[in-house]
C-alpha cells in the first residue's frame, strides 16, 4: 500500500487482510459515495482470519493468522490504525493466539471472541481496553467458536454459528457485561461457519457461511423481540470467511470464498427493497478479511 | 462406497510439472479437508498440502511450498495437486486423504491408492 | 517442526503376542496423535484418531494411550492379518508430521 496520507473523509468501508494463495497485507477503503477504492498502509505483518473494528476513529485489526510459503503463524496481534496518518502501530496482544476470530465493541471496549491456535478451538473471550492498552479475560462462551460470527446491539454482544472442531454449528449465544455470562439464544434455522453477522434495524443478520457440505447464499435475521429467526432474501453469490459490515442502513458483504473462487464481488443489502445488488468489485479476489466502517 | 481415485502420475525429468487428480466418489470434497501425502520408495509418510473446504485456505510442507499448488473443483468433486520445478526428491507415491475433524485436529480417514511420481534424467 | 520420534524401528513377534509400540512427541502435540496400519503397496489406514480413540471398523485389539508426550499404540493378541507397518502421527502444530514407523514382521 502507499504510504501518504489517506484523505480525509469520513465513512469509508476499511478491507483489511484476507486470503488468496497466501495471507495478505493490504489495506483498502471504499467509498460508497462515489464508487472509488483507496490503497493504504500495509498491515506490519500479512493476516487472514482476522476481524476488524473501530473504536474512536481508529481502526483496529485483530487476530488471524500469517498463511505464508515460509509457515503458518496464528496472531495474537492487536494493530491500529490511524486514518489520519495512514500509519499502522502494535498495540497490546490478546492472551493467545485467536485465528478466525469475532469481534464486536460495547462501550469503547472490543470484545475478541474465540478462534483458534492450532488444534484448539477457543471459547474464551477477552476485551481490550484502548485508554489502557490492556487485555482482561471476560467469561468463556457456552460453546468453542472458530468462524464465528459476532455483533453488538443494545449493548449486548452475541456470538453466531461457527465452528466446534467437530461441528459446524447453527446456535448462538448472547453475553451480557454486566453479569459477566453467556446464554444461549434461539438457533439459526441453518448450519453456519464463516458466515457474515451484522446489525441493521434492530436486527442481528448472518449471511452466507458454510453448512459443513456447502458455502451458502441464503441470509437469515434475528429479531430480539420476537426472539426468531426469519429468512430474508439470498445473496446473488455462495460465499463464506466473507467481510461484512453495515453503511448508512444497508449491508455490504466482501468477498469470500464460494468452495471453488476467491470472490471479488461487493454486493449491498437495502432493507426496504430487501434486495441484494453487485455495488463494486475488490481490486482482487479473497476470504477472511476484516472489514469495519469509520465513524462520522 | 467411500472413495478417492488418484491418478496423473509417471516419468518427469527434472524441473518439469505434472498435475495429479485425486476424484472422489461416495462423500462430496466439498465437505472435507483434502490432504495430500507422499511416500518415497522404502521410506516413511509425508505431508505434502491440505486445503480447507470453508475458507479456501491452503497449507504446504516448507518442501514443497511456492513449487505445488493444491486446489479443487467441486464440480467435478476432484482435488488436484499441480506439481511445478520438480526434483529427484520429489519420487515418491503421492496419496490424496479425506481429512475427519474431530475436537479440531484433522486424521485422515479415507485414502487413495496412491499414483507413483518418478523424477528422472 | 514437531519430531514424532517411533520405537522400535522393526519388531518380531508370533500370532497371539502383545505388541507395542511408541512414539515420541519433541514437544507437547496434546492428543492430537493418530495411529496408522500401512500393508506394502497399499495405502495406510487409520486405526486410532485422538490418542486413544477407536476409529469405526478397527478391531478392538488396537488400543492406544498417551502419557504426556509418549503415545502408545497396543495390539493386545496379534493376528496374521496385522503384520504391517505402523505410523503415528502428530496434526496439533503446523506442519503434520509422522514417526519414522514400525515394521511388525513375523518371528
Known amino acids: 500500500g502507499s504510504m501518504g496520507h489517506a484523505p480525509k473523509v469520513g465513512r469509508l468501508i476499511y478491507t483489511a487482510g484476507g486470503y488468496f494463495r497466501q495471507s495478505l497485507s493490504y489495506l483498502e477503503a471504499y467509498n460508497p459515495s462515489d464508487g472509488t477504492w483507496l490503497d493504504l498502509a500495509d498491515l506490519q505483518v500479512p493476516r487472514s482470519g482476522l476481524a476488524g473494528c473501530v473504536v474512536g476513529g481508529l481502526l483496529y485489526a485483530v487476530g488471524g493468522r500469517n498463511n505464508s510459503p515460509d509457515g503458518n503463524t496464528d496472531s495474537s496481534a492487536l494493530d491500529c490504525y490511524n486514518p489520519m496518518t495512514n500509519q499502522w502501530s502494535p498495540c497490546a496482544p490478546m492472551s493467545v493466539p485467536r485465528n478466525r476470530i469475532g469481534v464486536g465493541v460495547i462501550d469503547g471496549h472490543i470484545y475478541a471472541v474465540g478462534g483458534s491456535h492450532g488444534c484448539i478451538h477457543h471459547n474464551s473471550v477477552e476485551r481490550y481496553e484502548p485508554e489502557r492498552d490492556e487485555w482482561h479475560l471476560v467469561a468463556p462462551m457456552l460453546t468453542r467458536r472458530i468462524g464465528v460470527g459476532v455483533a453488538v446491539l443494545n449493548r449486548l454482544l452475541y456470538a453466531v454459528g461457527g465452528f466446534d472442531g467437530t461441528n459446524r454449528l447453527n446456535s448462538a449465544e448472547c453475553y451480557y457485561p454486566e453479569r459477566n455470562e453467556w446464554r444461549m439464544i434461539t438457533a439459526m434455522n441453518t448450519i453456519r461457519s464463516g458466515a457474515g453477522v451484522c446489525v441493521l434495524h434492530n436486527c442481528i443478520y448472518a449471511a452466507g457461511g458454510y453448512d459443513g457440505q456447502d458455502q451458502l447464499n441464503s441470509v437469515e435475521r434475528y429479531d430480539v423481540e420476537t426472539e426468531t429467526w426469519t429468512f430474508v432474501a439470498p445473496m446473488k453469490h455462495r460465499r463464506s470467511a466473507l467481510g461484512i459490515t453495515v453503511h448508512q442502513g444497508r449491508i455490504y458483504v466482501l468477498g469470500g470464498y464460494d468452495g471453488h473462487t476467491f470472490l471479488d464481488s461487493v454486493e449491498c443489502y437495502d432493507p426496504d427493497t430487501d434486495t441484494w445488488s453487485e455495488v463494486t468489485r475488490m481490486t482482487s479476489g479473497r476470504s477472511g478479511v476484516g472489514v469495519a466502517v469509520t465513524m462520522e | 462406497e467411500v472413495q478417492l481415485v488418484e491418478s496423473g502420475g509417471g516419468l518427469v525429468q527434472p524441473g518439469g510439472s505434472l498435475r495429479l487428480s485425486c476424484a472422489a466418489s461416495g462423500f462430496a470434497i466439498s465437505a472435507s479437508s483434502i490432504h495430500w501425502v507422499r511416500q518415497a520408495p522404502g521410506k516413511g509418510l509425508e505431508w505434502v498440502a491440505s486445503?480447507?473446504?470453508?475458507?479456501?485456505?491452503?497449507l504446504y510442507a516448507k518442501s514443497v511450498a511456492g513449487r505445488f499448488t493444491i486446489s479443487a473443483d467441486t464440480s467435478k468433486n476432484t482435488a488436484y495437486l499441480q506439481m511445478n520445478s520438480l526434483r529427484a526428491e520429489d519420487t515418491a507415491v503421492y496419496y490424496c486423504?479425506?481429512?475427519?475433524?474431530?475436537?479440531?485436529?484433522?486424521?485422515?480417514?479415507?485414502w487413495g491408492q496412491g499414483t507413483l511420481v518418478t523424477v528422472s534424467s | 517442526d514437531i519430531q514424532m520420534t517411533q520405537s522400535p524401528s522393526s519388531l518380531s513377534a508370533s500370532v497371539g503376542d502383545r505388541v507395542t509400540i511408541t512414539c515420541r512427541a519433541s514437544?507437547?502435540?496434546?492428543?492430537?496423535v493418530a495411529w496408522y496400519q500401512q500393508k506394502p503397496g497399499k495405502a495406510p489406514k487409520l486405526l486410532i484418531y485422538s490418542a486413544s480413540s477407536l476409529y469405526s471398523g478397527v478391531p478392538s485389539r488396537f488400543s492406544g494411550s498417551r502419557s504426556g508426550t509418549d503415545f502408545t499404540l497396543t495390539i493386545s493378541s496379534l493376528q496374521p492379518e496385522d503384520f504391517a507397518t505402523y505410523y503415528c502421527q502428530q496434526s496439533y502444530s503446523f506442519p503434520s508430521t509422522f514417526g519414522q514407523g514400525t515394521k511388525v514382521e513375523i518371528k
Open positions: 486423504a479425506r481429512a475427519y475433524a474431530g475436537d479440531g485436529v484433522y486424521y485422515a480417514d479415507v
Open positions: 514437544q507437547s502435540v496434546s492428543s492430537a
Open positions: 486445503i480447507d473446504p470453508e475458507t479456501g485456505e491452503t
